[in-house]
């Protein structure tokens, strides 16, 4: 586990950090997981990079942020928000959410407690 640098992370500071990092590899990694490497998801060129590579890139990006539950929650919510409109049905939303919840563990970070991923105002 990475050492936690701050107790919670100030909200405005977290927002700045999330804005600064590139969350695309995380979004691509999760999409690859739920699409099972199918080529029908052509919004990204997912064939060029293996899922494990995307996962590493994703973790590297998240590693640029302060390792606090607050900032991790902010990042996960932003990923959900970014991909919400691309998720075609309720089942896909649930699959995406499940993979998203596993992301901190995959990157060896603390999972953000009390993190509400239903942030899209009912769109997702």
């Amino acid at each position: 586990m990475r050492r936690e640098r701050g107790r919670q992370g100030d909200s405005s500071s977290c927002e700045r950090q999330v804005d600064r990092v590139n969350l695309k590899p995380c979004e691509q990694h999760i999409m690859q997981r739920i699409m099972g490497e199918q080529e029908q998801y052509d919004s990204y060129d997912i064939r060029s990079t293996r899922s494990s590579d995307q996962q590493q890139r994703c973790c590297d990006e998240l590693n640029e942020m302060e390792n606090t539950q607050r900032c991790m929650c902010e990042a996960l919510q932003q990923i959900m928000e970014n991909q919400c409109d691309r998720l075609q049905d309720r089942q896909m939303v649930q699959q995406f959410k499940r993979e998203l919840m596993n992301l901190p563990q995959q990157c060896n970070f603390r999972a953000p407690q009390r993190c509400d991923l239903d942030v899209s105002g009912g769109r997702c």
Epitope: Q8, D10, S11, E74, Q77, R114, C115, D116, V119
Partner: antibody
Framework: EVQLVESGGGLVQPGGSLRLSCAAS????????MTWVRQAPGKGLEWVAN????????DYLDSVRGRFTISRDNAKNSLYLQMNSLRAEDTAVYYC????????????????WGQGTLVTVSS | QSVLTQPPSISAAPGQKVTISCSGT????????VSWYQQLPRTAPRLLIF???KRPSGIPDRFSGSKSGSSATLGITGLQTGDEAHYFC???????????FGGGTKLTVL
């Protein structure tokens, strides 16, 4: 039937101490977060402290941190609140509550409440 | 002064619908789950809604919860005289590492 029964309240002078107890029954105590919530006379609800299932994590309201200590004894199905250096503003009904918080992606919610015990801090 | 803002009072006639708002910030409602409580005079509070929208067993579907951004709303339809009570919202604040309660809303059924 879930039951939470508080005891230990009473009149105490400023600077004094009290220990509140909460006896829990009707559910598997060791699998739930537990929480103390208080309510000053005629006022709203104020969260005081949380304790994790195994007692390993505790959170406190800023104004009570360092003065109050939340603890639990899972073998006795009991929750405690040790209150030291009491102040007039600590006067309230103190409720023992069961907290439904479970995993990383759920929230705090208080689905069962005791009847409350009144703590009065006055000289 | 509570960090979560609720209207102090609201009133409506029996059978009507009311909504009670709870306004916060990104560090509390914006990122965490909201619960709602009803407190009848001289009794302990009772959970009405948890995790933004879920109702515990025994709570009638006249009560509903929703959340958008940094605000949450409790809805009560088909108002009854027995609904006259104080209503409180609550959520975790990640910056404060604390549970926050709203100041409470007194509902009067005319």
């Amino acid at each position: 039937e879930v039951q939470l029964v508080e005891s230990g309240g009473g009149l105490v002078q400023p600077g004094g101490s009290l220990r509140l107890s909460c006896a829990a029954s009707g559910f598997k105590f060791s699998t739930f977060y537990m929480t103390w919530v208080r309510q000053a006379p005629g006022k709203g609800l104020e969260w005081v402290a949380n304790i994790k299932q195994d007692g390993s994590e505790k959170d406190y309201l800023d104004s009570v941190r360092g003065r109050f200590t939340i603890s639990r004894d899972n073998a006795k199905n009991s929750l405690y609140l040790q209150m030291n250096s009491l102040r007039a503003e600590d006067t309230a009904v103190y409720y023992c509550t069961r907290n439904g918080l479970q995993d990383s992606y759920s929230g705090d919610f208080f689905d069962h409440w005791g009847q409350g015990t009144l703590v009065t801090v006055s000289s | 002064q509570s960090v979560l803002t609720q209207p102090p009072s609201i009133s409506a006639a029996p059978g009507q619908k009311v909504t009670i708002s709870c306004s916060g910030t990104g560090s509390n409602i914006g990122h965490n789950y909201v619960s709602w409580y009803q407190q009848l005079p001289r009794t302990a509070p009772r959970l009405l809604i948890f995790d933004n929208t879920k109702r515990p067993s025994g709570i009638p579907d006249r009560f509903s919860g929703s959340k958008s951004g940094s605000s949450a709303t409790l809805g009560i339809t088909g108002l009854q005289t027995g609904d006259e009570a104080h209503y409180f919202c609550a959520t975790w604040d990640a910056d404060l590492s604390a549970v926050l309660f709203g100041g409470g809303t007194k509902l009067t059924v005319l």
